[in-house]
């Protein structure tokens, strides 16, 4: 089918575009290019006979056209007014016609934009601002980017006018980035110089430091105050209320007792007028205090939180220790001490990181210890467990199941019969039971304070008949003289006896057979080839018995030493060697032939015609099991002698 | 042997209209593409119309474009020229021709079309 | 459109002459030119085709040649039924078929 592929779709003013004909027809006489939908005489750019190769100018000519033997159109030095449909009709020699129709779209090249702002200092927490994309464009799409990142979703940040006009609202000293704006349409992209965003804020509540609010007798008083502000904020210091300097640090050296108090510390703003202040007490000790525990969480919530244990008071030039369990710390990637070793951070708790914890502050004569703390992880709950697990009962008997997670605090239970609430209680009891309580018994779990809920669902059948058994085994393909395979008669059933066989007899007595778990289970250990047998359990009540189907145990040996047949190791001289190696392996192995230790073939037979002298040396078979992943060989030494040189040499096969 | 047989001229008042035809012999007819081609009294050949041997595309001169309708029956052998508005310069001898690519090989007698009040 | 134009429009000659007609189309149009006969009263004859050709049935002191612009149509040795009108032809577009004015050719 005629078609017409614009190269390009979207073309820039100014540059060209080629309206390229595919599946142009054989045997043409002419061909004629229209702009629009249709074939319109008034609307006819050029014409071109093929025979003549005359190209002929239409009323829609504008010299921008040249059309080229094969019927493709070039328009160059596009114009806004060329987009839209083109309509290629093609007359054969026969004077069938054809016609397709094909489009392009002319877009402007961008300038590069820049970018207006309604308010240069904004206020954080007060002020909106609005960036303006300039200029405005036709057909253009607006983008912006925050640090070279698109927009962040935001309620604060609004995009309008058409994506022109980025509002934020509310603005925060987060808002603090560099604003670009791009103006984008099918042929170009241009992307404006970067306005930075200059958000006055603060002064937030100023931050006294260090932190330790404890100090011996004789040290020097460094405090440093800060408060995040823009401009930067102005400082005043009192002590006691009563004023002291004007600057961000404040520096008493050899301080005693009496220089214990109130320090504050005030921020000025002269831009946002504001005024914030923060108050530490400092203590004075004559001797270290009695150190003791805080916690940032009381109850975390197992491999969900983290717990920071913190040594107080905060002290300077002093040694904190620790010990979990009356231990010194283990070494653990889950355990991280601060870099005065005053805090202590359990990453993602256990129900194991109960404790207790004790910290420990070392003067020079001793280590006082804080009181243990003890943490309260809740955790779980775990899958549930239903005891007992039997899944067959016979009827008239009592069912009584018990449900257990392991849980903190402890779980609520509940039981569910076919997905149908009975009772919220930890025990089930059915007294007297019949075919009728046969089902799918749920117990649900539930952690009221970690908000988590488990489920562990059991199928009970109540029937005089006992099912036909079936056998589970945890190795399908066990290896020889290495696995053990352990065979299961499945389902566990109340009152129950388990028997078993072996190729239709009653177990063989072997140190390597084992029955446990009320005979319910048989363990094969270090299974050998001859143990690939089958194996068939059977249950049996006082009303009922039953069989499994057998099951044939696989087991993987070998490869064992090959053999290379035949014996012979004399040929004569142009006799054929016909080789061939065999070992006992399961399964199959890869068989492999080396001469003089060279690789030959990946076969089990090893043939040459006429053998020479030439052919003399060692053959060795090599043999490998990838189930097993072991290997074995053997080498046979061949002599070929000269014709008739001597007596008893094998012709040969 | 080709024979192509015009019929259908005459003499019509301006406005007016009439319809020619034009019987083929001995050729398969539907392989080829046909055309008119007419005369004026004392002047040289101009050409008309032309249509593909289906009859699927048809081809104008601009002088009877929109009035002028060129139309073929191939299980009758015929094409047919049905003139509209007809107008004192239609006046010709109106020929139909057989086409092969780029030549028109065979022609007919002619008709005579006289417009005329 | 490509014009085509003829010369001479009229020329008298006498039985026996070798006659030339000429046409010149105002842009190459390679070797696509056809000749065709007319007798009064009667159609139009394709005569040479593609600007050498001979149509079937022609008699062979018909020839054309030319290529490009200018083309010529011989008459070797001319006959009493060769008085007639010749007229040049090649394809175009949007006419499918431009005609040349016509060279008669009368009796001297």
């Known amino acids: 089918k005629l078609t017409i592929e614009s190269t390009p779709f979207n073309v820039a003013e100014g540059k060209e575009v080629l309206l390229l004909v595919h599946n142009l027809p054989q045997h043409l006489f002419g061909y004629s290019w229209y702009k629009g939908e249709r074939v319109d005489g008034n609307r006819q750019i050029i014409g071109y006979v093929i025979g003549t190769q005359q190209a002929t100018p239409g009323p829609a000519y504008s010299g921008r056209e040249i059309i080229y033997p094969n019927a493709s159109l070039l328009i160059q030095n596009i114009i806004q007014n060329d987009t839209g449909f083109y309509t290629l009709h093609v007359i054969k020699s026969d004077l069938v016609n054809e016609e397709a129709t094909g489009q392009f779209r002319v877009y402007p090249e961008l300038p590069k934009p820049s970018i207006s702002s309604n308010n240069s200092k904004p206020v954080e927490d007060k002020d909106a601002v609005a960036f303006t994309c300039e200029p405005e464009t036709q057909d253009a799409t607006y983008l912006w980017w925050v640090n070279n990142q698109s927009l962040p979703v935001s309620p604060r940040l609004q995009l309008s006018n058409g994506n022109r006009t980025l509002t934020l609202f509310n603005v925060t000293r987060n808002d603090t980035a560099s604003y670009k704006c791009e103006t984008q349409n099918p042929v170009s992209a241009r992307r404006s110089d970067s306005v930075i965003l200059n958000v006055l804020y603060g002064p937030d509540a100023p931050t006294i430091s260090p932190l330790n609010t404890s100090y011996r007798s004789g040290e020097n008083l460094n405090l440093s105050c800060h408060a995040a502000s823009n401009p930067p904020a102005q400082y005043s210091w009192f002590v006691n209320g009563t004023f002291q300097q004007s600057t961000q640090e404040l520096f008493i050296p050899n301080i005693t007792v009496n220089n214990s108090g109130s320090y504050t510390c005030q921020a000025h703003n002269s831009d946002t007028g504001l005024n914030r202040t923060t108050v530490t007490t400092i203590t004075v000790y004559a001797e270290p205090p009695k150190p003791f525990i805080t916690s940032n969480n009381s109850n975390p919530v197992e491999d969900e939180d983290a717990v920071a244990l913190t040594c107080e008071p905060e002290i300077q030039n002093t040694t904190y220790l620790w010990w979990v369990n009356n231990q010194s710390l283990p070494v653990s990637p889950r355990l991280q001490l601060s870099n005065d070793n005053r805090t202590l951070t359990l990453l993602s708790v256990t129900r194991n990181d109960v404790g207790p914890y004790e910290c420990g502050i070392q003067n020079e004569l001793s280590v006082d210890h804080s009181d243990p703390v003890i943490l309260n992880v809740l955790y779980g709950p775990d899958d549930p467990t239903i005891s007992p697990s039997y899944t067959y009962y016979r009827p008239g008997v009592n069912l009584s199941l018990s449900c257990h997670a392991a849980s903190n605090p402890p779980a609520q239970y509940s039981w569910l019969i076919d997905g149908n609430i009975q009772q919220h209680t930890q025990e089930l009891f059915i007294s007297n039971i019949t075919e009728k309580n046969s089902g799918l018994y749920t117990c649900q779990a539930n952690n009221s304070a970690s908000g988590h809920s488990r489920t562990t669902v059991k199928t009970i059948t109540v029937s005089a008949e006992l099912p036909k058994p079936s056998i589970s085994s945890n190795n399908s393909k066990p290896v020889e003289d290495k696995d053990a395979v352990a065979f299961t008669c499945e389902p566990e059933a109340q009152n129950t006896t388990y028997l078993w066989w072996v190729n239709g007899q009653s177990l063989p007595v072997s140190p390597r057979l084992q029955l446990s778990n009320g005979n319910r289970t048989l363990t094969l250990f270090n299974v050998t080839r001859n143990d690939a047998r089958a194996y068939v359990c059977g249950i049996q009540n006082s009303v009922s018995a039953n069989r499994s189907d057998p099951v044939t145990l696989d087991v993987l040996y070998g490869p064992d030493t090959p053999i290379i047949s035949p014996p012979d190791s004399s040929y004569l001289s142009g006799a054929n060697l016909n080789l061939s190696c065999h070992s006992a392996s399961n399964p199959s192995p890869q068989y492999s032939w080396r001469i003089n230790g060279i690789p030959q073939q990946h076969t089990q037979v090893l043939f040459i015609a006429k053998i020479t002298p030439n052919n003399n040396g060692t053959y060795a078979c090599f043999v490998s099991n990838l189930a097993t992943g072991r290997n074995n060989s053997i080498v046979k030494s061949i002599t070929v002698s000269a014709s008739g040189t001597s007596p008893g040499l094998s012709a040969g096969a | 042997e080709v024979q192509l047989l015009e019929s259908g001229g005459g003499l019509v008042q301006p406005g007016g209209s009439l319809r020619l035809s034009c019987a083929a012999s001995g050729f398969t007819f539907s392989s080829y593409a046909m055309s008119w081609v007419r005369q004026a009294p004392g002047k040289g050949l101009e050409w008309v119309s032309a249509i593909s041997g289906s009859g699927g595309s048809t081809y104008y001169a601009d002088s009877v474009k929109g009035r002028f309708t060129i139309s073929r029956d191939n299980s009758k052998n015929t094409l047919y020229l049905q003139m509209n508005s007809l107008r004192a310069e239609d006046t010709a001898v109106y020929y139909c021709?057989?086409?092969?690519?780029?030549?028109?090989?065979?022609w007919g007698q002619g008709t005579l079309v006289t417009v005329s009040s | 459109d490509i014009q085509m134009t003829q010369s001479p429009s009229s020329l008298s000659a006498s039985v026996g002459d070798r006659v030339t007609i000429t046409c010149r189309a105002s842009?190459?149009?390679?070797?696509?030119l056809n000749w065709y006969q007319q007798k009064p009263g009667k159609a139009p004859k394709l005569l040479i085709y593609?600007?050498?050709s001979l149509q079937s049935g022609v008699p062979s002191r018909f020839s054309g040649s030319g290529s490009g612009t200018d083309f010529t149509l011989t008459i070797s040795s001319l006959q009493p039924e060769d008085f007639a009108t010749y007229y040049c032809?090649?394809?175009?577009?949007?006419?499918?078929?431009?005609f040349g004015q016509g060279t008669k050719l009368e009796i001297k």
């Open positions: 032809q090649q394809p175009s577009y949007p006419s499918l078929f431009t």
């Open positions: 593609a600007a050498s």
């Open positions: 842009q190459s149009i390679r070797g696509y």
């Open positions: 021709a057989r086409y092969s690519p780029y030549v028109l090989d065979y």
